[in-house]
């Protein structure tokens, strides 16, 4: 928060924190995981590390009507430069190459952890 | 759900060379670091060798170190292990598996069988 004349002004989240917050989403994800996420919805995959939040919104923007990932979906918005819609394919995907939602989850967790720790928040 | 098949493996003679491969799918492999595990008959587990993600980190046992090269294909989900200069010693059962610190990400493939002998 910046604070201006005594009133407190939300300023721009820093990396560092939106990444940590949508880490702590992801981790809430998969503890509190139940039934199969997204009823066993299959995502494309991703095959390099380079345009990472823009090729895991494009994975998950497909998945419809599952409530467990719309706030990832909306936080992953937030590091992707440009808008994107369901349909929408990167070559950062495996075209032929679907998995799990619950195990695209995961992985991106672990990425994102690695990426906190190396401090690369953008 | 997630599946490591290793391949390449088989009867050679001392010094000569074989290539390990292991195809991976049902996880996001470009994100994990990965390993070549083996046990020789009657031992243990023993790493060979781990490569990171990205493919510029790697670590070799001091016993393989200068004849085995690890290496990995992220566009294909494929780890390799090109194995050179084989002894009879480097006689194991190999498993790809992911390198990964963190708990509840590991995962180990079937093994492929490797026999040095004349």
């Known amino acids: 928060l910046t604070c201006l004349g005594g009133f407190a002004s939300p300023g721009p989240v820093p990396p560092s924190t939106a990444l940590r917050e949508l880490i702590e989403e992801l981790v809430n994800i998969t503890q509190n995981q139940k039934a199969p996420l997204c009823n066993g919805s299959m995502v494309w995959s991703i095959n390099l590390t380079a345009g990472m939040y823009c090729a895991a919104l494009e994975s998950l923007i497909n998945v419809s009507g599952c409530s467990a990932i719309e706030k990832t979906q909306r936080m992953l918005s937030g590091f992707c430069p440009h808008k994107v819609s369901a349909g929408q394919f990167s070559s950062l995907h495996v075209r032929d190459t679907k998995i799990e939602v619950a195990q695209f989850v995961k992985d991106l967790l672990l990425h994102l952890k690695k990426l906190f720790r190396e401090g690369q928040f953008n | 759900g997630v599946q490591l098949l290793e391949s390449g493996g088989g009867l050679v003679q001392p010094g000569g060379s074989l290539r390990l491969s292991c195809a991976a799918s049902g996880f996001i492999f470009a994100w994990y670091d990965m390993g070549w595990v083996r046990q020789a008959p009657g031992k243990g587990l023993e790493w060979v060798s781990r490569?990171?993600?990205?493919?510029?980190?790697?670590y070799y046992a001091d016993s393989v170190k200068g004849r085995f090269t690890i290496s990995r294909d992220n566009s294909k989900n494929t780890l390799y292990l090109q194995m050179n200069s084989l002894r009879a010693e480097d006689t194991a059962v190999y498993y790809c598996a992911t390198a990964e610190d963190e708990p509840g990400y590991d995962y180990w493939g079937q093994g492929t069988l490797v026999t040095v002998s004349s």
């Open positions: 490569i990171g993600a990205h493919g510029n980190v790697t």
